[in-house]
Amino acid sequence: TVPPMVNVTRSEASEGNITVTCRASSFYPRNIILTWRQDGVALSHDTQQWGDVLPDGNGTYQTWVATRICRGEEQRFTCYMEHSGNHSTHPVPS
């Protein structure tokens, strides 16, 4: 088992909004849960966009999940990762 490296980034979207992207990379096996939580509960699937789980060329995999949020409400969102029985949560950077 190779645990993922998880990185959260933010980028400007429309006025007053930002897109936050959670990337998991260099993990094996390929089964992974990567999702956004808002206010501690599940963020609805229709407000998230997922990338495919793809080989990254080193025998490991990578994927991502993104959502658009209101600027100033970053604290209310965390990216949740679960892989091979391990889990972690990742805040949006300021």
Epitope: R37, D39, G40, V41, A42, E73, Q75, R76, F77, T78, Y80, E82, G85, H87, T89, P91
Partner: antibody
Framework: DVQLQESGPGLVKPSQSLSLTCTVT?????????WNWIRQFPRNKLEWMGY???????NYNPSLKSRISITRDTSKNQFFLQLISVTTEDTATYYC????????????WGQGTLVTVSA | DIQMTQSPASLSASVGETVTITCRAS??????LAWYQQKQGKSPQLLVY???MLADGVPSRFSASGSGTQYSLKINSLQPEDFGSYYC?????????FGAGTKVEIK
Amino acid sequence: DVQLQESGPGLVKPSQSLSLTCTVTGYSITSDYAWNWIRQFPRNKLEWMGYINYSGTTNYNPSLKSRISITRDTSKNQFFLQLISVTTEDTATYYCSYYRYDGAWFPYWGQGTLVTVSA
Amino acid sequence: DIQMTQSPASLSASVGETVTITCRASGNIHNYLAWYQQKQGKSPQLLVYNAIMLADGVPSRFSASGSGTQYSLKINSLQPEDFGSYYCQHFWSFPLTFGAGTKVEIK
């Protein structure tokens, strides 16, 4: 360590308002987290009532929405529960608690305060 | 709202026994589940979060499992301090709801 302490009257008359205070020490309620009220009825059923978060946003249980208000006093690091038009069905032990945004589970609770609604 | 159904409502067990408590959600909660222990006259204490993760300081004789709508809490080699009531709680969506509890008593 975050510590929470509930206070308020132990007896309220039917049709009146129930008002409780949660005093938080060890952490500023404006820094982070969701600050919640949960109650436990005499037969031990637990009910999540609602929260006020670090920025003052509230979220209430729809079963209580027309009767509940959660507010705060940031200068005293306190948050409050008001429940209007109470009946004997609102007799319960009331707890304050908080959760972090990594998941809505409750790591620490206050000691609870029993409120009896009776004429 | 998601309803949480716990079973059994109560059980009697001896010190050293293994007990299992189950919790069923009315919909798929995708492991968004916590377990609490409550002793008489005290506040609930967090035991498990994210369906399987033990909270800080929880003894390893406790374990939890499940997925979808079915979850369980297992206590291996029950100790005197484990007697009390146990509650599950989902955090998939609002409103957050709890199971009705399982009371674990000394046989």
